[in-house]
Interface confidence: low
């Protein structure tokens, strides 16, 4: 491998000791709590509720719940935690994914069940974009082997 | 309560540095994009730098660029700018302030005036 | 570099009456998020700045309902629907899009 290859993985290590994913583990698994307990346990259910989360074209805001505003101040500070700590690895698409994949790997074993799961990933792969960050392309969220794809 | 506390500005000869301060408290300093913005009286507010949570990613306006520094000590809750070659056309109040953790600038502190004169 | 464009760049008032403020960009402002990354603060004299609006459209906890943002892509508006004493100073907006860039201001002043 070529040397710059291999400086860039130490520095993405380093990058990644350094950083603290449990804001963003905390915010994901409120967030689809939040989601079952507006959905029932089947996160698919469609709602013909106008402003259900899945209308609500806030849900969709990188700054929703606002820190601006008190109503769930819990998960807006754990997003806004999360989404400073994603912003280390901004101008590294490959370590961003690493990101993703650590806190998926943290989480995966207190996911309750394969639809939990996918819901999970599902908001996983959207939290870069949710702050305001580019995602990253290729991203292989899958915990089951350790012979995943990093790019 | 949020206090943004900046020091370090004074008079300055052309070509000379100096280091601005700002100290924090009654926030997560460390959870917080920081910002120095600057206001002069012709040119109004002009975002000067900002660093990020950590420190990894720093972004510098075009007309500093290669000239001033931002840094932030994490222990000490302080951030830093490190003004070098410094022009006429620098002299200003210079605020920082705490992002709200996307990109609004949410807290600012009450500036430091720094004059570059001859 | 994007940059944003103010005007008026001075805007007499008379309390009670609406004041209106326009920011143009000179490249769209749409995140791919969907959301445009322009914010209004106002610097009262003596004082430092205060965010008064962010995305363009969403109001900073504790400025008053009369303040209000509107806008999309390249052009953008601040209004306030009934200006008071204590809203002169100079208004600004700011793009967050790539880095940061602030307008020239608008001077806003009773009659």
């Known amino acids: 491998r070529q040397q710059w290859e291999l400086q860039g993985d130490r520095r993405c290590q380093s990058q990644l000791e350094r950083a603290n994913l449990r804001p963003c583990e905390q915010h994901l698994m409120q967030k689809i709590q939040r989601d079952e307990d507006s959905y029932g346990r089947d996160p698919y259910s469609p709602s013909q509720d106008p402003y259900s989360p899945s209308q609500d074209p806030d849900r969709r805001d990188p700054y929703s719940p606002s820190p601006y505003d008190r109503r769930g101040a819990g998960s807006s500070q754990h997003q806004e935690r999360c989404c400073n700590e994603l912003n280390e690895f901004e101008n590294n698409q490959r370590c961003m994914c690493e990101a993703l994949q650590q806190i998926m790997e943290n989480q995966s074993d207190r996911l309750q069940g394969r639809q939990q799961e996918q819901q999970f990933k599902r908001e996983l792969r959207n939290l870069p974009q949710q702050c305001g960050l580019r995602a990253p392309q290729r991203c292989d969220l899958e915990v089951e082997s350790g012979g995943r794809d990093r790019y | 309560q949020v206090q943004l506390v900046e020091s370090g500005g004074g008079v300055v000869q052309p070509g000379r540095s100096l280091r601005l301060s700002c100290a924090a408290s009654?926030?997560?300093?460390?959870?917080?994009?920081m910002h120095w913005v600057r206001r002069s009286p012709d040119k109004g507010l002009e975002w000067v730098a900002a660093?990020?949570?950590?420190?990894?990613?720093?972004y510098y306006a075009d007309s500093v660029k290669g000239r001033f520094t931002i840094s932030r000590d994490s222990s000490k809750n302080t951030l830093f700018l490190q003004m070098d070659s410094l022009r006429v056309e620098d002299t200003a109040v210079y605020y920082c302030?705490?992002?709200?953790?996307?990109?609004?600038?949410?807290?600012w502190g009450q500036g430091t005036l720094v004059t570059v004169s001859s | 570099e994007i940059v944003l464009t103010q005007s008026p760049l001075s805007l007499p008032v008379t309390p009670g009456e609406p004041a209106s403020i326009s920011c143009r960009s000179s490249?769209?402002?749409?995140?791919?998020?969907?959301?445009?990354?322009l914010d209004w603060y106002l610097q009262k004299p003596g004082q430092s700045p205060q965010l008064l609006i962010y995305?363009?459209?969403k109001r900073a906890s504790g400025v008053p309902d009369r303040f209000s943002g509107s806008g999309s892509g390249t052009e953008f508006t601040l209004k306030i629907s009934r200006v008071e004493a204590e809203d002169v100073g100079i208004y600004y907006c700011?793009?967050?899009?790539?880095?940061?860039?602030f307008g020239q201001g608008t001077k806003v002043e009773v009659n």
């Open positions: 302030a705490r992002d709200s953790g996307y990109r609004s600038l949410l807290h």
């Open positions: 009654g926030i997560a300093f460390n959870d917080y994009t």
């Open positions: 660093i990020s949570y950590g420190g990894t990613n720093k």
């Open positions: 995305m363009a459209s």
């Open positions: 490249q769209s402002l749409v995140h791919r998020n969907g959301y445009n990354y």
């Open positions: 700011m793009q967050a899009l790539q880095t940061w860039t």
